[in-house]
Interface confidence: low
Amino acid sequence: GCALGGAETCEDCLLIGPQCAWCAQENFTRPSGVGERCDTPANLLAKGCQLNFIENPVSQVEILKNKPLSVGRQKNSSDIVQIAPQSLILKLRPGGAQTLQVHVRQTEDYPVDLYYLMDLSASMDDDLNTIKELGSRLSKEMSKLTSNFRLGFGSFVEKPVSPFVKTTPEEIANPCSSIPYFCLPTFGFKHILPLTNDAERFNEIVKNQKISANIDTPEGGFDAIMQAAVCKEKIGWRNDSLHLLVFVSDADSHFGMDSKLAGIVIPNDGLCHLDSKNEYSMSTVLEYPTIGQLIDKLVQNNVLLIFAVTQEQVHLYENYAKLIPGATVGLLQKDSGNILQLIISAYEELRSEVELEVLGDTEGLNLSFTAICNNGTFFQHQKKCSHMKVGDTASFNVTVNIPNCERRSRHIIIKPVGLGDALELLVSPECNCDCQKEVEVNSSKCHHGNGSFQCGVCACHPGHMGPRCECGEDMLSTDSCKEAPDHPSCSGRGDCYCGQCICHLSPYGNIYGPYCQCDNFSCVRHKGLLCGDNGDCDCGECVCRSGWTGEYCNCTTSTDSCVSEDGVLCSGRGDCVCGKCVCANPGASGPTCERCPTCGDPCNSKRSCIECHLSAAGQAREECVDKCKLAGATISEEEDFSKDGSVSCSLQGENECLITFLITTDNEGKSIIHSISEKDCPKPPNIP
């Protein structure tokens, strides 16, 4: 909780959690109770802090720019708005989350720039033949989807260095000389046709292309992708259009440090290096780009990659596409016969998805997304909507929180993959207290100016301490705060101010005593309850409430439950301990020691029952039952019984006989008489 966080300043208090507030009201607490100023706003109000003195900054969203989403066709593509809002400031209280809603709508008839990047290694000869009319066919199909379509063309083979190419003069001039066939010298990347709406020009360019060759199977296509993405002006990418890069190949691609084989060790710099002939001039100088570098530049330039690759390569490029935002893979027939349908399908797939990406200074920031897609369906922890129709709106709840109070603001961009539109977000921490602006330096409230007064408390100058800086260094001896010289100051549970202990607050109860040596929570427990819940804990000992006694206060002093029916405590056969009889007499039992078959003279008390039993014959024995009941006994004829704990009796009968029997006790404490017999009876007179 806020109050237990030990905050001594307003800023420390706000850092404990978003639920905490600080009371800057003067004289709000006892001088030592600085920590009491930090609590929930409700608790501070309840404690008497006036509302205008409660420092409790809240997270807030300030929208700077929120143009409505474009609906229908726009005359000017620069007027198109596909994300709303476009700019906002988020003031966040550390630990407190703020949710904002972002809406994305792919506008109808959005301009499309498509750059056709083709592998021109020898195996692509048949493909080159197939696509000679692709420009006009593609323009015709795309005109059904957009009224503003442009096409461009570039080609690639491989870095023209050993061991990727053969280096004899003959094979450098004609890498196909061993076939024999004429093909162009190996090249890295050539940008041939900037983006244009002239489809016939595209056809013409394609017809003029010649294949080239290299040795190993992987090609240098990633070098070409990097140049096509970053050479924005030369390629002709427009600001307000969908940028599609169609990568056509039948082989894998080299990346990263593969070029070390050729002694090329300078990392790719991600910059445009097209010379005056629009050829990649650093092909033999810079390493292939890494996948990470490609991702950065494709995202930065809003380029959506369509891998059109043959069957053997599909799996490989699917793995690359998983890593590259917005990338798709299409299966290319051996001769590129299905390239048109592949491009149209990929375009439709891209247009049916809206996915957000986050760029900028996000480290340590907690961002979570919920996508709200078709028909308002919520997808938690997702930032992508699929199966959308162009013109549909996708919404996203974005929840942001910062864990702690950093001193900087962060700039973040949330944008749909492949679109230029973005939401710019400035996240700034909200942790300052307004009361900190009003500082009374050398304040008289701080004992003759020994400190500065702000936010209701004193910040003491060096050499002074105490709630009002009233304690100088000469008064800082802690000896009077120690119970014994080797004991910690204030028992380690308080602060020594000017020779006196001010005990800490504790979540468990009160700490008190001149040395904070006492508390009301460190006593013994009975059944998990402090002092059995029948007493108060005072400095480690239970002080029992009225009616209770014992170390644990679990012993009642009442004797009511010990009094037997005859009004005698424990029937006079035991002691009343903790409200229960502890029977002292052997054989005594029962809640009040009322059962005791062996008490008094057990044998003689059964005489009337025994004699009746012996003198009666047959049916007359029934008459004895009442006599036996009065004597608290029953007679058993059973011979098989336990003799443990039995009492053996001998009585002189009326006829001078010796009567012997045994008494046992049943579970209810009643007497049972066994083995009755008469002995030594006098013989009757011998009368003839």
Epitope: L4, G5, G6, D12, L15, P403, N404, C405, P488, G492, R493, G494, D495, H504, L505, S506, P507, Y508, G509, D519, F521, S522, V524, R525, G528
Partner: antibody
Framework: QVQLQESGPGLVKPSQTLSLTCTVS??????????WTWIRQHPGNGLEWIGY???????SYNPSLKSRVTISVDTSKKQFSLNLTSVTAADTAVYYC????????????????WGQGTTVTVSS | EIVLTQSPGTLSLSPGERATLSCRAG???????LAWYQQKPGQAPRPLIY???SRATGIPDRFSGSGSGTDFTLTISRLEPEDFAVYYC?????????FGQGTKVEIK
Amino acid sequence: QVQLQESGPGLVKPSQTLSLTCTVSGGSISSGVYYWTWIRQHPGNGLEWIGYIYYSGSTSYNPSLKSRVTISVDTSKKQFSLNLTSVTAADTAVYYCAREGPLRGDYYYGLDVWGQGTTVTVSS
Amino acid sequence: EIVLTQSPGTLSLSPGERATLSCRAGQTISSRYLAWYQQKPGQAPRPLIYGASSRATGIPDRFSGSGSGTDFTLTISRLEPEDFAVYYCQQYGSSPRTFGQGTKVEIK
């Protein structure tokens, strides 16, 4: 003078449960002033906090071990115990029990009393 | 969790020299909840400093602690032979409690 003594098997088989007990002598385990703590140290490495228990039974565990660790207290025996399930060779370490002053307020003390430690090896 | 980073990893000094050990927290912590411990081979750690600057019982005054916020320092003004050991800082202001990785002070 409070003293702590760890006890338990020195060898535990992989996938089994490691069980250690710490006995408190010379002072009360039922004081409201202390957290009773377990810490371990892998061979040649630094110290890793496992968790603590308050005499009332409330606990706090290291998130990295939370799913496998249980700390319990028996105030009548003045003991607190550590159970670590599904152990692997990575749990081989010296295990210490220690006493810590409470978290809130200016209970400055930190881990002021330590046991001498017990070595536990996890091996089949 | 709060990450504590100690530097240097090893400090090679001669007896009589001054040792300065640093402990940096990944986020602001209250100095009330920072401690320093000394550990010698085969022994349990021994408390030296609590509350960033208060010496534990029986600790000689050549050991002193200072710092606040994210930067804390343990200073040994004149190294004695028995001071060569590993020193750890620890925060106990929030769970999980965390230790620094340790600084070894060895004889040069």
